[in-house]
């Protein structure tokens, strides 16, 4: 059993190294950042012209393209729930220092947990995605 787990870990490691998780990160960030100001907008300041297209609207097609590519990548982890969780953890770690607010972090986590399901894949039952906003102090 130990031998099998060791092989499984090695296989997961090489899968993670081969995988390109960037499309997933791009898809998620575009999803939660449609309007960055929706979290921090001063309620007393006038909002942007509702008739002018937002940068996100112009990138809508790009986002679905990211999602498709992301799902293709996650598909590789379909038969290994623990490895799927590690892939999600890696996405969280790669983006955690971009999220400088609790709400942003929680929303990103929510979307990340839903990602396998959005791709028609099984979501890992227990997968700890905890990091504090700002990630590790990399600088």
């Amino acid at each position: 059993r130990q031998q099998w787990e060791l092989q499984g870990d090695r296989r997961c490691q090489s899968q993670l190294e081969r995988a390109n998780l960037r499309p997933c990160e791009q898809h998620l960030m575009q999803k939660i950042q449609r309007d960055e100001d929706s979290y921090g907008r001063d309620p007393y300041s006038p909002s942007q012209d509702p008739y002018s297209p937002s940068p996100y609207d112009r990138r809508g097609a790009g986002s679905s393209q990211h999602q498709e590519r992301c799902c293709n990548e996650l598909n590789e982890f379909e038969n290994n729930q623990r490895c799927m969780c590690e892939a999600l953890q890696q996405i969280m770690e790669n983006q955690s220092d971009r999220l400088q607010g609790r709400q942003q972090e929680q929303q990103f986590k929510r979307e990340l947990r839903n990602l396998p399901q959005q791709c028609g894949l099984r979501a890992p039952q227990r997968c700890d995605l905890e990091v504090e906003s700002g990630g590790r102090d990399r600088y």
Epitope: P55, Q95, R98, R102, S133, G134
Partner: antibody
Framework: EVQLVESGGGLVQPGGSLRLSCAAS????????MHWVRQAPGKGLEWVSA????????YYADSVKGRFTISRDNSKNTLYLQMNSLRAEDTAVYYC???????????WGQGTLVTVSS | IVLTQSPLSLPVTLGQPASISCRSS???????????LDWFHQRPGQSPRRLIY???KRASGVPDRFSGSGSGTDFTLKISRVDAEDVGVYYC????????FGQGTKLTVL
């Protein structure tokens, strides 16, 4: 309405210490990274330090590393900057700023002036 | 990361367009596809105010005569028609690695 009010500035001798405070209101203070940015008289903006919403992660500009300490008290909605071993080049208006949640400085205070001189 | 703005001084006639450049010592594109570059405006005696974030997104309440463009290392802030209230100093800021500002561009009206 988001309000950030800095205090604690003043005249201090080189080598001395000072603690700046920033009282925040109008938003969930414990949900956002907060920053200190300074501006020397007649000069440009210089980012000084930032602290994540729970206070775990702290970031510093090289020019203040080891001398300045950023902290926050979420129960008091207050951000602090402890400044030690002050130098003449630390003379500036110090602004407190709230992060948008995506690494952008969305709201700024009016600033407090720190003068380091003998 | 070092940001270099040009010009440092920009005299403009009212109603005319203006353009400020900001060049970064390294690419500001994160792996998530976003450019971590913002633009700020500071009027004399006032605190800075955010105009543009993520290189091209106009902040809430900012007039549509302001626009940001660029990617990687080269970025531009454009004002389509300069107004009297646009005087002051404009700063670019990178947020890819910690945070740093450009040296500022002083816009004056002729």
């Amino acid at each position: 309405e988001v309000q950030l009010v800095e205090s604690g500035g003043g005249l201090v001798q080189p080598g001395g210490s000072l603690r700046l405070s920033c009282a925040a209101s109008g938003f969930a203070f414990n949900d956002y990274t907060m920053h200190w940015v300074r501006q020397a008289p007649g000069k440009g903006l210089e980012w000084v330090s930032a602290i994540s919403y729970g206070g775990t992660n702290k970031y510093y500009a090289d020019s203040v590393k080891g001398r300045f300490t950023i902290s926050r008290d979420n129960s008091k909605n207050t951000l602090y900057l402890q400044m030690n071993s002050l130098r003449a080049e630390d003379t500036a208006v110090y602004y407190c700023a709230k992060d948008s949640g995506y690494r952008s400085l969305l709201h700024w205070g009016q600033g407090t002036l720190v003068t380091v001189s003998s | 990361i070092v940001l270099t703005q040009s010009p440092l001084s920009l005299p403009v006639t009212l109603g005319q367009p203006a353009s400020i450049s900001c060049r970064s010592s390294q690419s500001l594109v994160h792996r998530n596809g976003y450019n971590y570059l913002d633009w700020f405006h500071q009027r004399p005696g006032q605190s800075p105010r955010r105009l543009i974030y993520m290189a091209s997104k106009r902040a809430s309440g900012v007039p549509d005569r302001f626009s940001g463009s660029g990617s990687g290392t080269d970025f531009t802030l454009k004002i389509s028609r300069v107004d009297a209230e646009d005087v002051g100093v404009y700063y670019c800021m990178q947020a890819l690695q910690t945070w740093t500002f450009g040296q500022g561009t002083k816009l004056t009206v002729l």
